[in-house]
């Protein structure tokens, strides 16, 4: 805590500028008006204050806004954001996507910190749902963001937001998450034609039920093995050899290399040997 001392004569700061980097901590505390700081927060980011000095500036803002900072201040926090605790951020009401982007930019290149996670949580809860623009922004900064959400949280994603999702955004999702996302994707892409639909739905298929896989097998989609290996085992087991052959098309030969891995292993064990032999791959049930 900085000791409270009177500001020396002639040192009262008329504005926030680089001359303040020469102030000791107690001088910053005594000579910088908190209201002035709040209105000129955008200047702080341009000045290489030490972390110690930033602590003093944060303390001044905390005293001015004990209930939490207004968005006009939050938007211009810059690297002072890195000094905020999750407890500080829980007091904020961030509604502007521009504010969110500005703060995510500060943390860019780093893993998602507890501060950022809290900020995102506050923002999304404030909006009531993960709309497309928000999802676009979050996945641009953190490709794994979607898969960090619980199935319950994912249930608030409207189907229209699914258009913002890229295949790499789903790389770390588990089956429970894809179970929630797949029906939304199916709804979002329902008006697309066969081949275009498959391109879009492909990365969500880890949540697809058997009947949808059967339907896809009738559309010459040529699913690759990597996608097939991510399908739910319980959805694959009821598929016939003919259906899997149609689903994979020319990629069916890849089953041999995967015969010891789920879901291929379990599927093979469910098939009649005569049917497997029709593939000519030497698969043993």
């Amino acid at each position: 805590e900085v000791e409270k001392t009177a500001c020396p004569s002639g040192k009262k700061a008329p504005e926030i500028d680089e001359s303040l980097i020469f102030y000791k901590k107690w001088e910053l505390e005594a000579c910088v008006d908190a209201a002035l700081l709040a209105t000129q927060m955008d200047r702080v980011n341009a000045i290489p204050f030490t972390y110690e000095q930033l602590d003093v500036l944060k303390h001044k803002l905390d005293e001015l806004y004990p209930q939490g900072y207004p968005e006009s201040v939050i938007q211009h926090l810059g690297y002072l954001f890195l000094k905020m605790s999750p407890e500080d951020i829980r007091k904020w009401n961030v509604t502007s996507l521009e504010t969110l982007k500005a703060l995510l930019e500060v943390n860019k290149g780093h893993e998602m910190s507890p501060q950022v996670a809290t900020l995102i949580d506050r923002f999304v809860k404030g909006r009531g749902q993960l709309d497309k623009d928000t999802l676009d922004t979050l996945t641009a900064f953190y490709p794994g963001y979607l898969c960090s959400l619980s199935p319950e949280e994912l249930s608030s994603v409207p189907p229209s937001s699914i258009w913002a999702v890229r295949p790499q955004d789903l790389d770390t999702c588990d089956p429970r998450q894809l179970d929630v996302l797949y029906p939304k994707a199916r709804l979002a892409f329902q008006n697309m034609n066969g081949s275009e639909y498959f391109v879009k739905i492909q990365s969500f298929l880890g949540g697809a039920p058997t009947e949808d896989l059967k339907a896809l097998s009738q559309q010459n989609v040529s699913m690759d093995l990597a996608t097939f290996m991510k399908l739910r085992t319980d959805a694959v087991l009821p598929l016939t050899v003919a259906e899997v052959q149609k689903l994979l098309g020319p990629h069916v030969e890849g089953l041999k290399a995967e015969e010891r891995h789920r879901p291929v292993r379990d599927w093979i064990l469910r098939q009649r040997q005569d049917d497997l032999d029709t593939l000519g791959l030497g698969l043993q049930g």
């Epitope: 680089e18 980011n45 341009a46 290489p48 204050f49 690297y79 930019e105 500060v106």
Partner: nanobody, 121 residues
Framework: EVQVVESGGGLVQPGGSLRLSCAAS????????GGWFRQAPGEQRELVAS???????KYADPVKGRFTISTDTAKNTVDLQMNSLGPEDTAVYYC???????????????WGQGTQVTVSS
């Protein structure tokens, strides 16, 4: 790993001169921010001199005209030439480096361990 190391401190008589040098590894002073702080006994740390392409060269009022900060890009050092030293300049002097972010603003900061400068007869 970034390291910032000071050298050149010592005991000097009033009116004398000293040259402090700060060598950095893992960060270049060119395009970033380099400075010298000092901390006298019982006092808080204060910036003495700094330089960066963004802000130019700056000095604290008590040292203006006596201290000169300079950088050697080839050696990646920031030096502080101190002339006309007085007892009030006695302190531990710290080198400071700050990363300038390409998108604006300032990133991580790095401090040296400090070097003692004592001005006494």
């Amino acid at each position: 790993e970034v390291q910032v190391v000071e050298s050149g401190g010592g005991l000097v008589q009033p009116g004398g001169s000293l040259r402090l040098s700060c060598a950095a590894s893992g960060i270049t002073f060119s395009g970033n921010y380099g400075g010298w702080f000092r901390q006298a006994p019982g006092e808080q740390r204060e910036l003495v001199a700094s330089m960066s392409s963004a802000l130019g060269t700056k000095y604290a009022d008590p040292v203006k005209g006596r201290f000169t900060i300079s950088t050697d890009t080839a050696k990646n050092t920031v030096d502080l030439q101190m002339n006309s030293l007085g007892p009030e300049d006695t302190a531990v002097y710290y080198c400071y480096a700050r990363v300038r972010l390409s998108r604006g603003g300032w990133g991580s900061e790095y401090w040296g361990q400090g070097t003692q400068v004592t001005v006494s007869s």
